[in-house]
Interface confidence: low
Amino acid sequence: EEELQVIQPDKSVSVAAGESAILHCTVTSLIPVGPIQWFRGAGPARELIYNQKEGHFPRVTTVSESTKRENMDFSISISNITPADAGTYYCVKFRKGSPDTEFKSGAGTELSVRAKPSAPVVSGPAARATPQHTVSFTCESHGFSPRDITLKWFKNGNELSDFQTNVDPVGESVSYSIHSTAKVVLTREDVHSQVICEVAHVTLQGDPLRGTANLSETIRVPPTLEVTQQPVRAENQVNVTCQVRKFYPQRLQLTWLENGNVSRTETASTVTENKDGTYNWMSWLLVNVSAHRDDVKLTCQVEHDGQPAVSKSHDLKVSAHPKEQGSNTAAENTGSNERNIY
């Protein structure tokens, strides 16, 4: 009679995490008598997965009725597979005795576990940066298997090319992580921009995972200032405005200086938003020129988002405005932003 063979028909089996794996094993003879055991790995450190004769293996069930006397199918199903279950599984026939002795092993079935990558997490720099500067974004995703993975970076739908990606660990592992760093050059129009990290993996069936970062959290667009003198509103009154344009974020404080002395400080509140996401704001002063003998230097000083102040000045020519006879006192304030100069 032909000697018993242990047949494991599948060289490899691939299963998604959370599913059940069926590992096939049949024997060609009922002789010699003795139990079947399943192991993960070979050699002295192998791990017992199932013993037909005894033991408690809650995740393992037999596919056929292995207790029947004539049964020659010893396939098993392992439930709720995780990446940690990956490895080569051997179906081993033992000869009955005291103790039982190993008789013959199957060739082994390699179980690989497909585990989805976690949602990519994109993080930007800790501090804001201004246009024309290059900033770094990182993208991380974890827990996937197999190791093969593709990562792409986009800015507003345009693929980026300046990035470096690593998959860890380099050697064999039950699951893997990917870490990528992309460099992005900021422009003044980037308040509404998004940086996207896209991860493609065999487990995702062609539907990649994406992580995003809004550049509004990264960019600081410094304001441009313009101080202008408006036409005379009433006799001897000049309206001076400070236009603060194209700034982001909104946090801004403006100080008016008259000949270097602080006149008024205010915080940007009722700003207008531009299409590109930046803001504009305007502050104004009403100056009673009749109260002045000399020219006045008006300075609009702006502190934006905690940065060093920027300023713009305007020289108000008092001599160009005829003074009213006997008018030695300044006119009353006529608005929240009006200012009389003494």
């Epitope: 197999p146 190791r147 093969d148 993975i149 593709t150 990562l151 792409k152 970076w153 693929e159 980026l160 090319s161 300046d162 990035f163 470096q164 990606t165 690593n166 998959v167 380099v170 050697g171 064999e172 990528s180 493609a200 993996h201 065999v202």
Partner: nanobody, 127 residues
Framework: HVQLVESGGGLVQVGDSLRLSCAPS????????MAWFRQAPGKEREFVAA????????SYKDSVKGRFTISRDNARNTFYLQMNSLEPQDTGVYYC????????????????????WGQGTPVTVSS
């Protein structure tokens, strides 16, 4: 250490076909991408074709598009370059290269992206 072993090169006539093979040996190895480069006598090494291990659309040098096909056999752990309608300008030493982790956008045409290289297999196309 990983070694890449190429085979399949040889002397052929114009219009003939060849299939090059590349088999990583050493430790169990999975790359992000595999590529073929070539170097003609007296010229710089140039990109020919690349494919991701995970699959997707391969990338080719313009002059070989439609004639060359890069493919992989994951079960055999082997990569191939099927070269049809060979021309004299296809002559050179063909190198297999492996990019272990992704170094840039898409499939790298830059040899500096590749971590491992084979010794090369010569292909001569005579007219």
């Amino acid at each position: 250490h990983v070694q890449l072993v190429e085979s399949g090169g040889g002397l052929v006539q114009v219009g003939d076909s060849l299939r090059l093979s590349c088999a990583p040996s050493g430790r169990t190895f999975r790359a992000y991408a595999m590529a073929w480069f070539r170097q003609a006598p007296g010229k710089e090494r140039e990109f020919v074709a690349a494919i991701r291990w995970i699959g997707g659309t391969p990338s080719y040098k313009d002059s070989v598009k439609g004639r060359f096909t890069i493919s992989r056999d994951n079960a055999r752990n082997t990569f191939y370059l099927q070269m049809n309608s060979l021309e004299p300008q296809d002559t050179g030493v063909y190198y297999c290269a492996a990019e272990e982790t992704q170094k840039g956008s898409g499939l790298g045409h830059d040899g500096r992206h590749y971590d491992y290289w084979g010794q090369g297999t010569p292909v001569t196309v005579s007219s």
